[in-house]
Interface confidence: low
């Protein structure tokens, strides 16, 4: 359904909301609902000399049989319900008298409902409605062993492991306005550390003293350790309980879910199920080895008469998980949208490497010291997300397969700059199977951790520009973080991009960074890459951007926990065949991040190969004319000269595999 429109008469006053219904929007974001009306009997004009407009506009929200009037507008004046004073506005009225578009700021869960745009003109009346569903939930997440053990990178990964992403300040603010409170400092997506407090008390004053609100410690060094606030958006599948008279150990619970065609649910999935109304007064195992239960109907014997996802702890200070051999129900998840967690993940490195969520009980609040110590002990496991490499290491060294001579006919394209104005250089290169005039590659000069001849040296890893799909500038801030994580990297910081720039990195593509700014490094300024620095070299910035805007992303990879190897055969591989070939060799298709990390270790191949995201790339350490130009870097093959478009999955190429 698109919209509901009603009108008393044909060919009379008509109102429309040209927007599909229901409209699903993220917690904490803003919403614009377009509403236009046509009044044939009283044509409107925008000339300043006309008399005031007579039509009356009314916006209301209908939920659970109750209508709340948000605002009323007539004769160019807008009266807003005082409860929504800072919340709703008509951005285009009265400048465009027939445009009743509504803007709603900082969406909260309770902003869900049916929005009605009603226009009255004399005795005529017409309206249109749109259902709005605010989706998502913010939850606090804590390391299993003790409080404040997550640095910024691990905080992001912890959320991702729990079917969530790190929350934005806007999402935490919206959750706070919805009633969320937590006296625990946690990372947010903009690299700030905050916590929401409704009832200020000793130990929880933060920077706001006795006033309610979200406390902030500002932008923190990424090595400092705190908890994290995660945001779970939605799930396609279903959370359900599995039980038996004798209950399950953790391993038995995992096996039981698998027997039922499912897997243990993550904390984020349980939160979404709770938000949808799940209520179970029985604790169950989750994928991160935590034990929790969702309470939607408060009762004294189920979580202390409080609502929420309750957590079972071993210690009175709300740390430590139950022993894996203790017995609880199993909370399972079935659906396609799960994030894989390796079978042995939680057995590696001891308890300090496991992250969990905490619920703060009212009679046992942990005080938050005003001076937080930096650098608490941290675990060393690097969390990764799909694809996860659950392979047993092969005792055999991977053989270097034979390669082919360059195919005659590969076309080199002169330097171009695409329509959007900021482009890198595509190069023809010798890779069989692309055919003449189809290979467009981009030069991603990157900076690496290990010394490659003739290349600048950046301690600590590789910064690279990433465009995961076929089109340019397609990633929101949240999607950008996930894209880097999916490729075995993390979103880069401004400092990392600056260091890469200083070491010679240039890329004329705007990309997200972890502080929610959008930047790109330019060593040799040219017309479409001027940005905010005119003719001076430097990292260009668009500053902090709304998280819903779309750009590319700059990722950072600091180590390779395994080995990337080049694979080929006479007929080469389609994308599916490449996946299967790598798997048949106890490996997986490498991610872009893994290829960058391998390139930084010296991997040099003048043949493009499939990667896990369906892209086609090749690493060049020693530049030569036939291999992607005059600079080292990882080259990307595009379909189109403006450097967009992924290769056809049925086309045949080599492959890069990864063995962990």
């Amino acid at each position: 359904a698109v919209t509901v429109e009603t009108s008393d008469h044909d060919n009379s006053l008509s109102v429309s909301i040209p927007q599909p219904s229901p409209l699903r929007v993220l917690l904490g974001t803003s919403l614009t609902i377009p509403c236009y009306f046509i009044d044939p009997m009283h044509p409107v004009t925008t000339a300043p000399s006309t008399a005031p407009l007579a039509p009356r506009i009314k916006w209301s929200r209908v939920s659970k049989e109750k209508e709340v009037v948000l605002l009323v507008a007539t004769e160019g004046r807008v009266r807003v319900n005082s409860a929504y004073q800072d919340k709703v506005s008509l951005p285009n009225y009265p400048a465009i008298p027939s445009d009743a578009t509504l803007e709603v700021q900082s969406l909260r869960s309770n902003d869900s409902g049916v929005y009605r745009c009603e226009v009255m003109h004399g005795i005529e009346d017409s309206e249109a409605t749109l259902e709005v569903v605010v989706k998502g939930i913010v939850f606090h997440y804590r390391a299993i062993s003790t409080r404040y053990t997550l640095d910024f990178d691990r905080a992001q990964r912890a959320c991702l492991q729990n079917s969530a992403i790190i929350a934005t300040p806007e999402q935490l603010q919206a959750a706070y306005e919805d009633g969320f409170h937590q006296c625990d400092a946690g990372w947010l997506a903009d690299q700030t550390v905050r916590y929401p407090i409704h009832t200020p008390r000793e130990g929880c004053y933060g920077d706001k003293d006795e006033f309610p609100g979200v406390r902030t410690y500002g932008i923190r060094d990424t090595n400092e350790t705190y908890d994290v606030y995660c945001f779970a958006e939605e799930m396609e599948g279903e959370v359900f309980y599995a039980t038996s008279p004798e209950k399950f150990t953790f391993q038995e619970a995992a096996n039981e879910c698998r027997r039922l065609g499912a897997r243990l649910a993550t904390t984020g999935q349980l939160y979404l199920a709770w938000q949808a109304g799940m209520d179970m007064c029985s604790a169950g195992w989750l994928a991160d080895r935590s034990v929790r239960y969702p309470i939607s109907k408060a009762r004294p014997n189920c979580g202390g008469n409080l609502l929420g996802v309750r957590t079972v702890y071993v210690h009175a200070n709300q740390t430590g998980y139950p022993d894996p051999s203790s017995r609880y129900d199993a909370i399972c998840y079935t659906g396609e949208d799960f994030v894989d967690i390796p079978e042995n993940f939680f057995g590696v490195g001891g308890e300090e490497d496991i992250t969990v969520q905490t619920v703060t009980w009212p009679d046992m609040e942990l005080p938050l010291p005003r001076n937080i110590t930096e650098g608490e002990a941290r675990g060393s496991v690097i969390l990764t997300v799909k694809p996860i490499f659950e392979v047993s290491p092969s005792p055999l060294e991977p053989e270097e397969p034979f390669t082919f001579a360059p195919e005659i006919g590969a076309t080199a394209f002169a330097e171009v700059e695409n329509e959007t104005g900021e482009a890198t250089r595509p190069w023809g290169f010798p890779t069989p199977g692309l055919g003449p005039a189809t290979a467009f590659t981009s030069e991603d000069l990157v900076v690496q951790v290990t010394a490659v001849p003739g290349q600048p040296h950046l301690p600590g890893g590789v910064v690279f520009h990433y465009r995961p799909g076929p089109t340019r500038y397609s990633l929101t801030f949240e999607e950008a973080q996930q894209a880097c994580l999916r490729t075995g990297a993390v979103i880069a910081s401004p400092e990392q991009l600056q260091a890469a720039y200083e070491a010679g990195y240039e890329q004329c593509d705007a990309g997200w960074l972890r502080d929610q700014t959008v930047r790109y490094p330019i060593v040799s300024p040219r017309t479409p890459c001027v940005g905010d620095k005119d003719s001076s070299p430097g990292v260009r910035t668009y500053g902090v951007r709304p998280s819903t805007e779309t750009y590319d992303v700059y990722c950072f990879v600091d180590r390779l926990e395994g080995e990337v190897f080049f694979a080929t055969r006479l007929e080469q591989f389609t994308f599916q065949e490449a996946l299967e070939f790598c798997e048949s060799h106890n490996a997986t298709l490498a991610t872009t991040g893994q290829l960058y990390a391998a390139w930084s270790r010296g991997l040099d191949k003048c043949y493009a190969g499939w990667l896990a995201d369906g892209s086609l790339r090749y690493p060049i350490v020693t530049p030569r004319p036939a291999c992607g130009g005059d600079k080292p870097g990882v080259r990307t093959v595009y379909l189109y000269p403006n450097q967009t478009g992924l290769p056809d999955p049925l086309s045949r190429h080599h492959a890069f595999c990864f063995r962990g």
């Epitope: 004073q85 800072d86 506005s89 951005p91 700021q105 700014t517 905010d532 910035t541 668009y542 500053g543 902090v544 951007r545 709304p546």
Partner: nanobody
């Protein structure tokens, strides 16, 4: 209602001074870069001055450099533009506008999201 309101316009003499103020209603200015623009009759709207979120970075168009000064007071939700050494060619409708919280500030109108309704400045003998 979220809006910007300009005030302080009026008539001035060549060589004289005026002080324009831009007030935010319904939202905090401290997340936004703020720009001042002007539009003379029959001419395009031009960016003349802007201030970054922190106020640390300011930009001026060449024609007003050294004569106009932009300043901000986030606590009061205002951004002021002081117009000194006025010239007849400064006659225009002056608008303030905000763009998302960027740390440098542009003078291009297309970068700005929310606009005030303007205040008239007339410079004549």
């Amino acid at each position: 209602q979220l809006q910007l309101v300009e005030s302080g316009g009026g008539s001035g003499q060549p060589g004289g001074s005026l002080r324009l103020s831009c007030a935010a209603s319904g939202f905090d200015l401290d997340y936004y870069a703020v720009g001042w623009f002007r539009q003379a009759p029959g001419k395009e709207r031009e960016g003349i001055a802007c201030t970054s979120v922190s106020g640390a970075n300011t930009t001026y168009v060449d024609t007003v450099k050294g004569r106009f000064t932009i300043s901000r007071d986030n606590a009061k939700r205002t951004v002021d533009l002081s117009l000194d050494s006025l010239k007849p060619e400064d006659t225009a409708v002056y608008y303030c506008a905000t763009t998302w919280g960027i740390h440098w500030c542009p003078l291009s109108a297309s970068e700005y999201r929310r606009w005030g309704r303007g205040t008239q400045v007339t410079v004549s003998l």
